[in-house]
């Protein structure tokens, strides 16, 4: 799902109130709800019909450091009998997210909010069919 | 997937460096690849085995105020012949993700990170069948 | 190991009631699910209904819904299936299953029989 734009204006102080200098905010030290947790069953993405596979990008400037993207391992699904079936797809579940930027020069330090792309997994599709003519 | 414990020296200024004052720190305006779209097929929830519904949810005092939940139709998945097999399991795939939450007194406005647990979608899963017996 | 413990099953006459209680226990686990399939003489086995535990979702058979109800108790991890306006085609071996870790582990029971007849 999709972050809709700031149109900044969720970072400006309301009109009545003075302009922030330099144009930068405040950033409160500490996460909110840091210790919550996902409760996601351990190798779901081994028994989905749509399994997938996980690779984990690692930057020591961002925050959280470790992102981890999803690949879906099969063009179709696997069925039943454990083979993989074509006519069903394989498809990336995708989910845009923040990180935190660090950018220090020296001692100055400042943190910039960054759009992410995740794939945090796959699922299974029934394609629309569409019967067209050859010319 | 899950975030990992910032134990705040992310936030941190190098050892050598006076701390931050008043335990917050600069956040820069703006969002960096703030144009970045998610691809995702139209309609995936619906054509998925295993589909789902969103339900909304929004605060003004949250960056992103709209934040979207997935919720598994479901209990089994959908097989080719568009009938709930309760042989397999429609389950939930969860992201962890940063919002921004906005804390204003007055003219005085600061922000902090907040950890959102998301459900993104639904995949189907065969589960590992295991005998036991009554008593 | 998640043990089942069930309760119920038996002979009712035609139009009848009956009620089945299952129950999962030992060790720390999860629930995603708990519900019923049935196997008649002959034929395959075939669902008949089950509850989700995150948010109590009923879900039914066509071929039961209006007679059967399916109701938890959260608290002793267990569910009871009760059966109204039973059919003889109603007979069957009952199964009693729990799904859970998320709905990737199914474990299953013995049956028990239950025979509608006059």
């Known amino acids: 799902r999709k972050i809709p734009k700031v149109g900044h204006t969720f970072f400006q102080k309301p009109e009545s109130c003075p302009p922030v200098p330099g144009g930068s905010m405040k950033l409160d030290i500490g996460i909110i709800n840091e210790n919550q947790r996902v409760s996601m069953s351990r190798n779901i993405e081994s028994r989905s019909t749509s399994p997938w596979n996980y690779t984990v990008t690692w930057d020591p400037n961002r925050y959280p450091s470790e992102v981890v993207q999803a690949q879906c391992r099969n063009l179709g699904c696997i069925n039943a009998q454990g083979k993989e079936d074509i006519s069903m797809n394989s498809v990336p579940i995708q989910q845009e997210t923040l990180v935190v930027r660090r950018k220090h020069q020296g001692c100055s330090v400042s943190f910039q909010l960054e759009k992410v792309l995740v794939t945090v997994g796959c699922t299974c599709v029934t394609p629309v069919i569409h019967h067209v003519q050859h010319h | 997937r899950k975030i990992p414990k910032v134990g705040h020296t992310f936030f941190q200024k190098p050892e050598s460096c006076p701390p931050v004052p008043g335990g917050s720190m600069k956040l820069d305006i703006g969002i960096i690849n703030e144009n970045q779209r998610v691809s995702m097929s139209r309609n995936i929830e619906s054509r998925s085995t295993s589909p789902w519904n969103y339900t909304v949810t929004w605060d003004p005092n949250r960056y992103p105020s709209e934040v979207v939940q997935a919720q598994c139709r479901n209990l089994g998945c959908i097989n080719a012949q568009g009938k709930e097999d309760i042989s397999m399991n429609s389950v939930p795939i969860q992201q962890e993700t940063l919002v921004v939450r906005r804390k204003h007194q007055g003219c005085s406005v600061s922000f902090q990170l907040e950890k959102v647990l998301v459900t993104v979608g639904c995949t189907c899963v065969t589960p590992v069948i295991h005998h036991v017996q009554h008593h | 190991e998640v043990q089942l413990v069930k309760s119920g099953g038996g002979l009712v006459q035609p139009g009848g009631s009956l009620r089945l209680s299952c129950a999962a226990s030992?060790?720390?686990?999860?629930?995603?699910?708990m519900g019923w399939f049935r196997e008649a003489p002959g034929k395959e086995r075939e669902f008949v209904a089950a509850?989700?535990?995150?948010?109590?979702?009923?879900y039914y058979a066509d071929s039961v819904k209006g007679r059967f109800t399916i109701s938890r108790d959260n608290a002793k991890n267990a569910v009871h299936l009760q059966s109204n306006s039973l059919k003889s085609e109603d007979t069957a071996v009952y199964y009693c299953?729990?799904?859970?870790?998320?709905?990737?582990?199914?474990?299953w029971g013995q049956g028990t029989q239950v025979t509608v007849s006059s």
């Open positions: 299953y729990a799904d859970v870790q998320g709905g990737l582990h199914r474990y």
């Open positions: 030992g060790g720390t686990f999860s629930l995603f699910a």
């Open positions: 509850i989700r535990w995150s948010d109590g979702s009923s």
